[in-house]
Amino acid sequence: TSHLVKCAEKEKTFCVNGGECFMVKDLSNPSRYLCKCQPGFTGARCTENVPMKVQNQEKAEELYQK
């Protein structure tokens, strides 16, 4: 089974635009990294800007779900 741990200090630059880095701990596979992006960013490394229109739409959906 795999679980997520926060990246070590030296690995944090895997993610950009303020994204938070996590390492997938999996005994059967080499280390993989995942990014939790800041609002307004997306992509495997948080490299892409989310257009404002989409951001607003996501916020509206979030409020609706609440």
């Epitope: 030296k10 944090k12 630059t13 950009v16 635009n17």
Partner: antibody, heavy 116, light 107 residues
């Protein structure tokens, strides 16, 4: 052993096009981030574009946006930089580099000269 | 875009000298700064990543420090092969940006 080999540079007239290739070996291509960085003669390093082969995310410097296109073929472990509407100020050595936590491996570079 | 301002732009030093190069970011870049060495006609080589971590195979006389906006590359005892140009680069924010370079020359 990790290797990056650029090709496709040469002399081109202003307004012309070139396609640069960056052939990679010795690492998992789809798990990295590929960047193109250029260096004009006697000048410093300037970031040009990047692609994340895993999800196809692309980014461009403002100076090349709309003129250059970065792409990757994971089956060939090769990244490309399609350069259109070339200008004299695009004259430079173009390097590709892999990025894990920084730009850790670099190719030898390929010279692009834009001149009439 | 984030501006990375390196100083000095050039310096003259002797073998055995301690050399310090600084880099200032125009806004907070956390510890997402790398340092590269480039020799004429060659591709840059990574020395330091994440501000203070020595890249594999790089001699221990190279060290990096800093966080936020102020960063330093130190060569504790300059060797003949260290005469080159050094660049800092931030990768906290897109686009990645480089400093203008510091040329280390023989005194």
């Amino acid at each position: 052993e990790v290797q990056l080999v650029e090709s496709g540079g040469g002399l081109v007239q202003p307004g012309g096009s070139l396609r640069l290739s960056c052939a990679a070996s010795g690492f998992t291509f789809s798990g990295t981030w590929i960047h193109w960085v250029r260096q004009a003669p006697g000048k410093g390093l300037e970031w040009v574009a990047a692609i994340t082969p895993a999800d196809g995310s692309t980014n461009y410097a403002d100076s090349v946006k709309g003129r250059f296109t970065i792409s990757a073929d994971t089956s060939k472990n090769t990244a490309y930089l399609q350069m259109n509407s070339l200008r004299a100020e695009d004259t430079a050595v173009y390097y590709c580099a892999t990025y894990m936590f920084a730009m850790d491996y670099w190719g030898q570079g390929t010279l692009v000269t834009v001149s009439s | 875009d984030i501006q990375m301002t390196q100083s000095p732009s050039s310096l003259s030093a002797s073998v055995g000298d301690r050399v310090t190069i600084t880099c200032r970011a125009s806004q907070d870049v956390s510890t997402a700064v790398a340092w590269y060495q480039q020799k004429p006609g060659k591709a840059p080589k990574l020395l330091i990543y994440s501000a203070s971590f020595l890249y594999s195979g790089v001699p221990s006389r190279f060290s990096g420090s800093g966080s936020g906006t102020d960063f330093t590359l130190t060569i504790s005892s300059l060797q003949p092969e260290d005469f080159a140009t050094y660049y800092c680069q931030q990768s906290y924010w897109m686009p990645p940006t480089f400093g203008q370079g510091t040329k280390v020359e023989i005194k």
